[in-house]
């Protein structure tokens, strides 16, 4: 009979053990253990009838298809075998043990006592068959094993071979190298690799296999295991395998698919190919006259680009548009994207107009092309070029007029200062009861009219000022101070200021230039109590044109001493001869209290100490500060008066031969203008030169050379 055994261990004994076994007996024990185990069988006792080749009684150990051992007898002889200490090991998880006794036993035999147990199979050590062993790493455990792969590989669904993920390779560069995975090491098994070369339309891909080519093949069947196929549109090239690389392939297409397949076995090194894009050839190029093309090549193919540029002083001209460079490209159909442009000489065109200046052409025919030359000059004698610039400009390669010092900036024509169009006479009488000034004698003289329309009725007054540049008037701060204030200093609104220049007779303003104010700037420290820092500036809305009757006065050097005592200076104004009249009467056309024609007076500078003493002796809080100087005569008779305020006290500078504004009419004592021992007090302009330049937005050094010393 048969006994089925499924336990992981157990004991098998001959029938009747430990007594003698019966004759003519047959028992089979079928032992089955789980997969991943084998069965180990050994005998603790063995005593069977001996016979030649165990013909009589025996124990036979076998698997499904193989006899592992046959035992009989008591001890091993040449023809019979006992198990002794021997262990029987099944190759698999099944073992069959059969005991058989014949019909007669001459002696009494005790039989056998055997034990079995399931033992683990170390598949990692024992599997020699490539078809079953792990591709990379094998891991044994009791009852089984599993496989794993090196970094970058994936375990195939067969749980044994290692493949790679290589189906998503896109190549878009014009040249490149493609290899099998891990090249030159053996390529992975069970892999499907896909390589796409996708270039711009117009290119054609050329393939060239290089170095090693080693793909598993078969002697009879073409590439049944591993292979490369090349797909170009609907056409498939290949399969390719073996050790001989295919010849270079010209695909005639911009899009190529390379498929590489490997099965689950084999150790081959793979392949490497390089690809290169080829394109249509474009015709030879000739550079333009006065130009060049870069890069210069014998041949140009699709996508090659060429930069056309011109020699210095020439510009690329394409479709009537000037440019520095022009790029053309070889197209897929083998034609150039554009015709070669021409090189045209640079033209700086008509030079910019110079305010208060003129232009002369040094080159014949008034040429304005590259290397032509022009010369700017200022409208003399009213304007002079800043920094004594040459005024010479050359047409540059960039197409702009360039000066060695100023670059592309135009020169500046600065107003000449302190040079009246007619020279002042030596004999000069006072303003009060005074002498008429000839037109052009005091071309810097400005009449400042302030009409504050923000009050009802309007406030109206006037003063004088001195032109410093085409846009700036210098005057006294008290002229431009809002009059409705007690001690606070607030400038009048610029809308309420009108400046008249080139004015000679106030009855006839037609020949004069009148200008509105853009800015009114009082000295920040002006003191209404003592008139210290009595200086202000008016910026005109528009620069005034200079001419014989309108020219600036020069500013002095920065000197704290101011004008030297006893020096003679001139003051002009339309001041009042009768101080008891109102401004309304002055400005209304019917009266003659305002001098119709500009008056002027010659006055000596009074020593500072003398002037201070003369005012300190008076009742009232008079203060002659270091920012003031006095002028006039001890005996009186000649003086400035109301309406002359802010006017320039000018002294002739022998070094520069120019008139310089040293003072501004500021204030005088309580007695009437021109009284005995009542000196006129003037703002000392030389203390404020830096402040004036700062307000006008010009560095002093820019304008200093005007007064040559």
């Amino acid at each position: 009979h048969t006994v089925e055994l499924n336990n992981m261990f157990g004991q098998i004994q001959s029938p009747g053990y430990p007594d003698s076994y019966p004759s003519d007996s047959e028992v089979t024990w079928n032992i089955t253990v789980p997969d991943g185990f084998r069965i180990k069988l050994y005998f603790m006792h063995f005593n069977l009838e001996s016979s030649y080749l165990c013909e009589y009684d025996y124990v036979k150990v076998e698997t499904e298809d193989q006899v592992l051992a046959t035992f009989c007898g008591r001890e091993t002889t040449d023809t019979e075998q006992t198990p002794g200490q021997e262990v029987v090991l099944s190759p698999g998880s099944f073992m069959s043990i059969t005991f058989r006794s014949d019909f007669s036993n001459e002696e009494r035999f005790t039989g056998f006592d055997a034990h079995y147990m399931a033992v683990d199979v170390d598949e990692c050590k024992e599997r020699e068959d490539e078809e079953l062993s792990c591709d990379h790493y094998c891991h044994n455990y009791i009852g089984g094993y599993y496989c794993s792969c090196r970094f970058g590989y994936i375990l195939h669904t067969d749980n044994r071979t290692c493949r790679v993920e290589c189906s998503d390779n896109l190549f878009t560069q014009r040249t490149g190298v493609i290899t099998s995975p891990d090249f030159p090491n053996p390529y992975p098994k069970s892999s499907e690799c896909l390589y796409t070369i996708e270039l711009e339309e117009g290119f054609m891909v050329n393939l060239q296999f290089e170095d090693i080519f080693d793909i598993e093949d078969h002697p009879e069947v073409p590439c049944p295991y591993d292979y490369i196929k090349i797909k170009v549109g609907p056409k498939v090239l290949g399969p390719f395998c073996g050790e001989k690389a295919p010849e270079p392939i010209s695909t005639q297409s911009h899009s190529v698919l390379i498929l590489f397949h490997s099965d689950n076995s084999g150790e081959n090194r793979g392949w490497r190919l390089s690809y290169r894009a080829a394109g249509n050839e474009c015709p030879e190029l000739q550079p333009p006259v006065h130009g060049k093309i870069e890069p210069s090549q014998a041949k140009y193919f699709f996508k090659d680009q060429v930069l056309v540029s011109c020699d210095t002083g020439y510009k690329v001209l394409k479709d009537n548009v000037e440019m520095d460079t022009f790029q053309i490209e070889c197209l897929k159909d083998g034609t150039w994207s554009n015709k070669i442009p021409t090189c045209k000489i640079v033209d700086c065109r008509a030079p910019g107009e110079l305010e208060h200046g003129l232009i002369t052409f040094s080159t014949r025919n008034n040429l304005t092309t590259y290397k032509s030359e022009i010369k700017y000059s200022c409208q003399e004698p009213y304007y002079k070029m800043l920094n004594n610039n040459t005024g010479i400009y050359t047409c540059s390669a960039q197409g702009v007029w360039m000066n060695k010092v100023l670059g592309r900036s135009l020169p500046t024509c600065l107003p000449e200062c302190g040079q009246p169009s007619r020279s002042l006479p030596s004999l000069v009488k006072r303003i009060i009861g005074g002498r008429n000034a000839e037109p052009g004698l005091f071309p810097w003289q400005a009449l400042i009219v302030v009409e504050d329309t923000s009050r009802v009725p309007n406030d109206k007054w006037f003063g004088s000022g001195a032109l410093l540049s085409a846009s700036w008037i210098l005057t006294a701060a008290h002229v431009l101070r809002s009059q409705r204030r007690d001690t606070t200093v607030i400038p009048v609104s610029k809308e309420h200021v009108t400046v008249y220049l080139g004015l000679h007779d106030v009855r006839d303003k037609s020949g004069a230039v009148n200008s509105s104010a853009a800015r009114v700037v009082l000295h920040p420290d002006f003191n209404i109590q003592n008139y210290n820092h009595d200086i202000a500036l008016v910026q005109l809305q528009e620069p005034v044109p200079l001419g014989p009757h309108v020219m600036p006065v020069c500013l002095p050097r920065l000197e704290p001493e101011g004008p030297a005592p006893h020096m003679l200076g001139l003051v002009a104004g339309w001041g009042i001869s009768n101080p008891n009249v109102t401004v309304d009467e002055i400005i209304s056309s019917g009266t003659r209290t305002l001098s119709d024609v500009l008056q002027y007076v010659k006055l000596p500078v009074v020593p500072h100490a003398e002037c201070k003493t003369s005012y300190e002796s008076r009742s009232g809080n008079y203060s002659v500060t270091e920012n003031m100087f006095c002028a006039g005569y001890y005996e009186g008779g000649k003086d400035t008066c109301l309406g002359d305020s802010g006017g320039a006290f000018v002294i002739f500078d022998d070094l520069s031969q120019r008139w310089v504004v040293q003072g501004l009419v500021s204030w005088g004592g309580p007695e009437e203008c021109g009284s005995k021992q009542v000196y006129g007090v003037y703002t000392k302009v030389s203390n404020y030169v830096d402040w004036v330049w700062e307000q006008m937005g010009l560095p002093q050094s820019v304008v200093e050379p005007q007064v040559e010393r």
Epitope: S454, R455, P457, D459, K460, Q483, L642
Partner: antibody
Framework: QVQLVQSGAEVKKPGASVKVSCKAS????????IEWVRQAPGQGLEWIGE????????DYNERFKDRATFTADTSTSTVYMELSSLRSEDTAVYYC??????WGQGTLVTVSS | EIVLTQSPATLSVSPGERATLSCKSS????????????LAWFQQKPGQSPRLLIY???TRESGIPARFSGSGSGTEFTLTISSLQSEDFAVYYC????????FGGGTKVEIK
């Protein structure tokens, strides 16, 4: 014609604020100063300050500097005077004046708890 | 600030008589640049807004009768009503126009 029209009478509690308006017509509003003057019942005139609508420039009497605020809306030719932290002694008729010559009809502000 | 003192506080006058009102300033109101005295006179009747009579100390506002005249300079100013009419009985204020502007305390002209 040229005139200044003020907003109506106001009754306020101590500590509150009042905003009086003054609408100008018939002249160039932006270019003339508008003054504010007040008169307590049976008392004289007291100058509060002034504003130039075009520029927004203001001058204040020191006594009112911290409590009075003048504003101008040039789109409607209207000037406003706001007086804050009202007390009973602020009860008065408030006038707007165009630089002395043209007076509004006055606005009575009563401050009472 | 400039203080203006008006006197008398009340002036009793018969119709047709001359009235002289005084206004004294704590500071000089004459501006030497504009040659103006910044002083104005106003008339106020009960329940009405003040009305400008005189500006620049002596210039009569348009529409003001000639019987009203202003004089003075510097610190002392006078408003004269040469022949009082019934409509002239009111309170009169002087005002100086240097910022901050100030008013006098007023003079009440009543029928005698």
């Amino acid at each position: 014609q040229v005139q200044l029209v003020q907003s109506g009478a106001e009754v306020k509690k101590p500590g509150a604020s009042v905003k009086v308006s003054c609408k100008a017509s018939g002249y160039t509003f932006t270019g003339k100063w508008i003054e504010w003057v007040r008169q307590a019942p049976g008392q004289g005139l007291e100058w509060i300050g002034e504003i130039l609508p075009g520029s927004g420039s203001t001058d204040y009497n020191e006594r009112f500097k911290d409590r009075a605020t003048f504003t101008a809306d040039t789109s409607t030719s209207t000037v406003y005077m706001e007086l804050s932290s009202l007390r009973s002694e602020d009860t008065a008729v408030y006038y707007c004046v165009r630089s002395e010559d043209l007076w509004g009809q006055g606005t009575l502000v009563t401050v009472s708890s | 600030e400039i203080v203006l003192t008006q006197s008398p506080a009340t002036l009793s006058v018969s119709p047709g008589e001359r009235a002289t009102l005084s206004c004294k300033s704590s500071q000089n109101l004459f501006n030497s640049r504009t040659r103006k005295n910044y002083l104005a006179w106003f008339q106020q009747k009960p329940g009405q807004s003040p009305r400008l009579l005189i500006y620049w100390a002596s210039t009569r506002e348009s529409g003001i009768p000639a019987r009203f005249s202003g004089s003075g300079s510097g610190t002392e100013f006078t408003l004269t009503i040469s022949s009082l009419q019934s409509e002239d009985f009111a309170v009169y204020y002087c005002k100086q126009s240097y910022i901050p502007f100030t008013f006098g305390g007023g003079t009440k002209v009543e029928i005698k």
